[in-house]
Interface confidence: low
Amino acid sequence: FSGDGRAIWSKNPNFTPVNESQLFLYDTFPKNFFWGIGTGALQVEGSWKKDGKGPSIWDHFIHTHLKNVSSTNGSSDSYIFLEKDLSALDFIGVSFYQFSISWPRLFPDGIVTVANAKGLQYYSTLLDALVLRNIEPIVTLYHWDLPLALQEKYGGWKNDTIIDIFNDYATYCFQMFGDRVKYWITIHNPYLVAWHGYGTGMHAPGEKGNLAAVYTVGHNLIKAHSKVWHNYNTHFRPHQKGWLSITLGSHWIEPNRSENTMDIFKCQQSMVSVLGWFANPIHGDGDYPEGMRKKLFSVLPIFSEAEKHEMRGTADFFAFSFGPNNFKPLNTMAKMGQNVSLNLREALNWIKLEYNNPRILIAENGWFTDSRVKTEDTTAIYMMKNFLSQVLQAIRLDEIRVFGYTAWSLLDGFEWQDAYTIRRGLFYVDFNSKQKERKPKSSAHYYKQIIRENGFSLKESTPDVQGQFPCDFSWGVTESVLKPESVASSPQFSDPHLYVWNATGNRLLHRVEGVRLKTRPAQCTDFVNIKKQLEMLARMKVTHYRFALDWASVLPTGNLSAVNRQALRYYRCVVSEGLKLGISAMVTLYYPTHAHLGLPEPLLHADGWLNPSTAEAFQAYAGLCFQELGDLVKLWITINEPNRLSDIYNRSGNDTYGAAHNLLVAHALAWRLYDRQFRPSQRGAVSLSLHADWAEPANPYADSHWRAAERFLQFEIAWFAEPLFKTGDYPAAMREYIASKHRRGLSSSALPRLTEAERRLLKGTVDFCALNHFTTRFVMHEQLAGSRYDSDRDIQFLQDITRLSSPTRLAVIPWGVRKLLRWVRRNYGDMDIYITASGIDDQALEDDRLRKYYLGKYLQEVLKAYLIDKVRIKGYYAFKLAEEKSKPRFGFFTSDFKAKSSIQFYNKVISSRGFPFENSSSRCSQTQENTECTVCLFLVQKKPL
């Protein structure tokens, strides 16, 4: 016996969040893994008085304590609809079915005399049917439904007389069913029987407050189990050759402070006081855990030496239950001020360390949904995915000997103190219906797929490719708004006087009269922050730099009456100094953010983008920028993410759609102006960049979710892309969806009607497609009332906790970008596409492994789109150059300009132009390739201020 469970909280220093196998493992379970599903008799059988069944303590408890529940009589009626249960089992394709025998259905008053014939026949028929189907039965003798007569006559499990009576009942079951049953469970989760039956009073028999009774009950349950195990071991195992255990349930807990010894001690105590209470005598040294003996000496019964010897080793495997009943409620004592956690993998590791690596059957696992959820139990899929992933990791990475898994539960039914307010079935049952049809939920389809594949196959992404991007590919980095320096920060050479220092010993400068020196004109490098920008860009080794101008700084009045020439000079310097390093600029004219609209003050006060005249003001501003910078800038973005301004103009859907309309017009006016006036001489290209996350159905088994995913793309991307790239009008699907909600009185929103002139103005006003892509969203359909953009879409988002995610919960889903690029090409034709921002936030200030992982994986998918799908991808701009103070850490540089290690990673990808074959010699000609100019770099770094 090892007892080293507490070591589990000393975290592995090698844990890396970007080794995805530590979050989710695409792998299969061992070859003969035992897949099953379970039910409890009281929960699903119904017929509590039918055919001679006696009442149980729960039948009584329901009538006395759960007044809003008539009885378990409705439930799923498994006693009547046995065939329907068997069909459900067939559907899923399980290897075993774990069910419990109702003690009072066999022996109405609990005492083993002549069994109730109808009850005996029911279980016999069930077992025969399972054997016929090649489904192994795992039979639980006691799942909480003690015959009421034994409670009333003896006081139930408080009285050790029950031990022998239980053994008689077990003997009968072994005799009658043992030829067909190879796996037996004596008692299901004795902790809950004792703690909630006699401590909190939440479970039958509903006694509470007497701690001595709680531990007496626990004591008798352990002795009852042990007696039955010895009985089976001696009299039945030799010829029946089965295995027997007891299902022990537990929560899991994490310390508040992972390095604090006291917190770790409390976590160990927490586990020991719940799981150890029963596991230590049975799987450990035969006695209660030392901590419990010390703490509860006044109420905890004592095992004699002989009893310890008798208890020890009385289980042929470790049957473990991990589900909501052990979490909610978790009594205060068990929580011990630490943090409850659903980390099944760690719980299994604790069992491995504490009980010397036993063979483990997960005898109950799953979560619950609200009773209103019918067959679309999306969150249940993700809970199951998470739990199963943790089990697989435990097997494959931690070498834990889990040999089987019981999904809980086959059917919706009576959920103890929660009665019918929650559902735990993989099959939906309408309790008010006569026929109690078993309808497979999404989770049933999901579990069926898991069983069929014996785990998780990697279907989402294809293997990495080797190859390179074209020689003219833009390798970029994006920055948000650059605030211009109003005055050059470096005034040297502008003062013509000569000074002598410390001439009189007073440590001051003294002007030398009569001497005048030559000054020099202002230079770009007088701007300190340009110097910083250039140093960072040079280290990035990019070919392109995307940054945004500050409209409010360039035109403080919002019109051309007051042009800030110094700001324009500053921006011209950024571009021209970049060009000296071989870095071209992609300039964004307008970059609003959630916190700051970035409009000139007068425009902001005149209703901003709700006012159509803002579009004309934007055209004038764009014209000024084209005129002043266009000789140097060949790639322009008019507006960054206009489709995200809905976050700001969100008072109503009509505000959102009105603002969007004016943004589209503003862009089109600017594009038309460039096309007419500047393109002939400047030969640049103009577009606008759209926020373009991909969307996947949260629940792939629900048609409504597939429709929601497409609807998300329509409302998010097509909303702007359709009018500009294609038709000059809003997407028909989006218009119709909003109109349909309007007709049904669910929304008063309406998309603006476009005139023929407006359609002509908008259509075709892009020279390339610019997409900002960060992540993939998992979407589900949910009908939402209200007249705002967010509710018009009828979409909710789901966070998949098994996915690698950033601190701001951006999921790393590389294959989403490839799907997006294909969708854009399919919908809008074969055009040049730039990914104008793509990146992830990463907490690390130096070794930003998450960002490196993200860049590598996402660029792989972009390369697949280029090489395999033949998408005309022209550039990738990583987001972003430097992080801002107190904002999520998206930067390659910290806010105080310290470089992170992802820069070298990106450098390597850029210099390789992707992911070339080993020894690939496909180099670009000198003119095309951006060779690093060592002298330039030296000058940038050393140029005096």
Epitope: H65, L330, N331, K335, M336, G337, N339, F368, Q417
Partner: antibody
Framework: QVTLKESGPVLVKPTETLTLTCTVS??????????VSWIRQPPGKALEWLAH???????SYSTSLKSRLTISKDTSKSQVVLTMTNMDPVDTATYYC????????????????WGQGTTVTVSS | SYVLTQPPSVSVAPGQTARITCGGN??????VHWYQQKPGQAPVLVVY???DRPSGIPERFSGSNSGNTATLTISRVEAGDEADYYC???????????FGGGTKLTVLG
Amino acid sequence: QVTLKESGPVLVKPTETLTLTCTVSGFSLNNARVGVSWIRQPPGKALEWLAHIFSNDEKSYSTSLKSRLTISKDTSKSQVVLTMTNMDPVDTATYYCARSVVTGGYYYDGMDVWGQGTTVTVSS
Amino acid sequence: SYVLTQPPSVSVAPGQTARITCGGNNIGSESVHWYQQKPGQAPVLVVYDDSDRPSGIPERFSGSNSGNTATLTISRVEAGDEADYYCQVWDGNSDHVVFGGGTKLTVLG
């Protein structure tokens, strides 16, 4: 739709007994998972819990006011009644009733629905 | 009896994050609930069971609880969040409800 509505006198004289009624709709008072509390708030001051009645009719009272309070319920009328004896001007406050639900546990998961409150002034 | 201590006031600029604390002896082992109360209105439950949000409460409201302090965090604070906030626990030993003294959240500007 779950609602609670408090009713009772607006003005009470010192030494008199205050009787407040909370009428509930949208749920049943004999639901095993529901309890009702009374809370008060003197003008400009914090919330102060007074009493609670559990689904099984068990009652719990604020220690400092226990001797003056009685809480009861009439399930058939969907009403919870609070009486407070020997009223004093310092008892001037807005009195709220609120529902608590156990969603899956031993403890209540907070007071999820409150009445709009009834203001009681104690003055001679 | 169990005592919950809250700071009388917290001020924060719009768009920033507000953190309101609730101190109590080993409060981490209790379930903490948080209420928002605007002038002239009844309290509204914004977080229950330490960190769960009732439906209709924005994701900006979150809670945590460990050791001797529970915290209500309101990210991206809006002017409409200006209100009094109360923490509450059930004292399991006495079956009493305990409220904190309340914190007035002021949104600057």
